[in-house]
């Protein structure tokens, strides 16, 4: 028998520095977690103790903090090289700055193979990107070889900016011939490493003949066997065992997100490459693990540029940006409109001639807007200003909801109106009218939404049975501020870009902004 240790990360999302327990900015260092310096300590400890070790990343290193905003992927290549990753799969967020924003900082600089079998380049891009990412890689480990085959969410064109010269194929259809090639190369230990979410990971384990292990990402799935060490609630045991269609037991793993855990899976193979046993657990990277001093010193060196950036002007406002709780928790506020407009703008994807865009709607809990911005400071808006407005380090995500769920959400928005509670919704691409004289749960008297399948966008009444795409904070997607109906009833959820980054990019693009209060939210006569 031959034993392999798979160390894995996924959805690190720019958390190069240690973070608080909820993966936001580290405040009390003695209670902070993760970060590449701490990760390196643990990886090195395992490499020294065990003979056959692979360090793999399942995508979405890009996007999530000011590190990515400033360094645009160069930080990912630099620190992943320093940690000596063995391979990485492309995630959807790796395309956030377009194909060029992937090729130059990451693909050309990574000292490890970057993989995806279901992304096919065409046109002029084909020769430019040739060899910079691969469908699979055969890695020598000890006296054996291990095949790693990559995959990426086929939804990427709707979630990011891969352009028109990359085709995202069905994962299973694309993976099978590559796995067959590996078998033809007499490679009998095969890991599928990719970024399509836990449901697809399980399907790959079930359907792709010859895959021995699946290491996934995208859905931030936390798996654990035994008592979990932190706040994350396991979605299942680690590893999660899937019985393949040809009767094999295939371990599937994922390691939550944000570099908080290091996935640790031990696999025992027989001489024919069959999995005999698999066991392990994610390792919580808490403060009991010291940060590696040399990596930490490097982080501190790179950090200097971030501090300078946060005080630079992004753009100007010529109006007061009202982000006060007195406004945003009671009525339409122009800060809410600005943020929602930025959220929609960030999700412009013309992937179908029938649609002017794939999504037109935004909702945003008023309680998530934490500060106004005064225009009387020469109109200057900085990253620092935006960090005061959006201090929680969240993301603006894409969900699919039925009209009936949206109606419930808007009822919840005003079910206890007047108490300055955070659930009051700010909107974009939606016109809502409330009648507060009616009983809670029946206060929405009009709810019109902007069409997407139209050449001239206009507002139509919400249809209860129709499925709509909506951009919203991850906080709401996870049922925050009492929006349990969104969490329970959402049909699809894809994590998006860092909230501050979305707004800062929009302001930089617009240069001068002047958001107004324009009647998106109304109260029917006599009730307000």
């Amino acid at each position: 028998a031959w034993e392999l240790t798979i160390l894995h990360t996924n959805d690190v999302h720019s958390r190069l520095e240690q973070t608080s327990e909820d993966s936001s900015k580290c405040v009390n260092a003695s209670r902070c977690m993760g970060g590449v310096a701490r990760l390196f300590t643990k990886v090195q400890q395992i490499r020294r103790a065990e003979p056959n070790v692979l360090l793999l990343d399942a995508g979405d290193q890009y996007q999530g903090t000011i590190w990515f905003t400033v360094y645009k992927g160069a930080e990912v290549a630099h620190f992943m090289n320093a940690l000596r990753y063995d391979a990485m799969a492309l995630g959807n967020h790796e395309f956030d700055n377009g194909v060029e924003g992937l090729i130059e900082p990451l693909l050309k600089e990574a000292k490890f193979p970057i993989l995806s079998a279901n992304i096919k380049a065409k046109g002029p891009l084909a020769s430019q990107i040739s060899g910079l990412y691969l469908p699979y890689k055969v890695l020598p480990v000890g006296d054996e070889v291990v095949g790693i085959v990559g995959y990426t969410s086929k939804e990427t064109p709707f979630l990011s900016n891969p352009g028109t010269n990359l085709v995202f194929e069905d994962e299973i259809t694309a993976l099978q011939p590559e796995v067959d090639k590996l078998k033809t190369l007499n490679v009998n230990k095969i890991i599928a490493l990719g970024h399509s979410g836990f449901e697809m990971d399980k399907l790959i384990a079930q359907k792709v003949r010859g895959v021995d292990v699946v290491v996934g990402g995208h859905s931030n799935t936390f798996l654990y066997t035994g008592n979990p060490p932190s706040k994350e609630v396991p979605a299942g045991k680690y590893p999660f065992i899937v019985t393949s269609d040809d009767g094999r037991k295939v371990p599937v793993v994922q390691a939550y997100a944000f570099g908080k855990y290091l996935g640790y899976l031990k696999i025992e193979f027989d001489e024919r490459g069959n999995v005999i046993s698999s066991h392990g657990n994610p390792i919580l990277l808490n403060s009991s693990i010291p940060e590696d001093p040399s990596i930490k010193a490097d982080i501190n060196k790179w950090r200097i540029k971030l501090d300078n950036y946060s005080t630079q002007e992004l753009g100007k406002t010529i109006v007061y940006l009202d982000g006060s709780s007195q406004s945003c928790r009671f009525r339409e506020c122009n800060m809410g409109n600005l943020i929602c407009d930025a959220m929609i703008n960030n999700n412009l994807r013309h992937t179908d001639e029938m649609f002017w865009n794939h999504v037109s709607m935004c909702i945003l809990n008023g309680g998530g807007i934490r500060s106004p911005i005064d225009e009387r400071n020469n109109g200057t808006i900085t990253w620092e200003n935006l960090a005061a407005v959006l201090p929680f380090g969240g993301t603006f995500d894409l969900v699919q909801l039925k009209g009936s769920t949206l109606k419930k959400a808007f009822e919840h928005s005003v079910h206890r109106y007047g108490q300055s509670t955070g659930e009051f919704l700010q909107v974009g691409g939606i016109h809502v009218v409330y009648d507060l004289s009616r009983k809670p749960g029946d206060r929405v008297v009009k709810l019109d939404v902007l069409c997407t399948k139209c050449r001239v966008p206009s507002y139509d009444p919400l249809k209860m049975d129709e499925v709509y795409k909506v951009i919203l904070p991850n906080f709401l997607a996870n049922g925050g501020d009492g929006f349990q109906m969104i969490k329970d009833e959402l049909l699809r959820h894809d994590s998006g870009d860092q909230d501050i980054n979305v707004v800062s990019t929009y302001i930089s693009k617009m240069k001068v902004i002047y958001p107004a209060v324009e009647g998106r939210i109304k109260f029917s006569t006599g009730s307000h």
Epitope: D86, A110, K111, K137, V138, L139, P140, T184, L185
Partner: antibody, heavy 118, light 107 residues
Framework: QVQLVQSGAEVKKPGASVKVSCKTS????????IYWVKQRPGQGLEWIGW????????KYNEKFKGRVTITADKSASTAYMELSSLRSEDTAVYYC???????????WGQGTLVTVSS | DIQMTQSPSSLSASVGDRVTITCKAS??????VAWYQQKPGKAPKLLIY???TRHTGVPSRFSGSGSGTDHTLTISSLQPEDFATYYC?????????FGQGTKLEIK
């Protein structure tokens, strides 16, 4: 473009050692295998071994084990093959080659002639 | 080790001819066979891998076929620059092994 440039011809006495270098450029050194291949005068090709610079894993053809040492210097993007206890049958052209994606030899160095003669 | 036996060891042909070189493996190598061209004093050049996939820049007159133990390289219409020695190689398992070569000469 991908290039592999080998060190120059060597003449060695039996029992001596020789170290052939293979300097690469035009691609990321750590991401591809470097293979070494032997070709005796007027003869066919023999695979000596590989090094994968990413994790410095080395594999030798059993036939060459013991006298051959393959190494790499990541910072210089250069691979080396050292052959010790030279004998006359080691007289050959030694090639380094790079894979495309494992196991076939897509790009070759120009070859280094090693002559073993007393 | 897997033995690769090429035939013929040499052959004479004329410009425009169709030429076939065969390679027999001592055991099943599936479709894991590559073909190389070597000219005197030069390094070998990859022509084909995976039995029938042409390497970048290789003219379409070169084609490969086969599976299991029997593999073939075909040059559909010989050009003057094609006179060289050709080697097959199995990339199925280590140690990777080559055929002894086929020398293609001008008739």
């Amino acid at each position: 473009q991908v290039q592999l440039v080998q060190s120059g011809a060597e003449v060695k006495k039996p029992g001596a050692s020789v170290k052939v270098s293979c300097k690469t450029s035009g691609y990321t050194f750590t991401n591809y295998y470097i293979y070494w291949v032997k070709q005796r005068p007027g003869q066919g090709l023999e695979w000596i071994g590989w090094i994968y610079p990413g994790n410095l894993n080395i594999k030798y053809n059993e036939k060459f084990k013991g006298r051959v040492t393959i190494t790499a210097d990541k910072s210089a993007s250069t691979a080396y093959m050292e052959l010790s206890s030279l004998r006359s049958e080691d007289t050959a052209v030694y090639y380094c080659a790079r894979d495309d994606n494992y196991a076939w030899f897509a790009y070759w160095g120009q070859g280094t002639l090693v002559t073993v003669s007393s | 080790d897997i033995q690769m036996t090429q035939s013929p060891s040499s052959l004479s042909a004329s410009v425009g001819d169709r030429v076939t070189i065969t390679c027999k493996a001592s055991q099943d190598v599936s479709t894991a066979v590559a073909w190389y061209q070597q000219k005197p004093g030069k390094a070998p050049k990859l022509l084909i891998y995976w039995t029938n996939t042409r390497h970048t820049g290789v003219p379409s007159r070169f084609s490969g076929s086969g599976s299991g133990t029997d593999h073939t390289l075909t040059i559909s219409s010989l050009q003057p620059e094609d006179f060289a020695t050709y080697y097959c190689q199995q990339h199925y398992s280590t140690p990777f092994t080559f055929g002894q070569g086929t020398k293609l000469e001008i008739k």
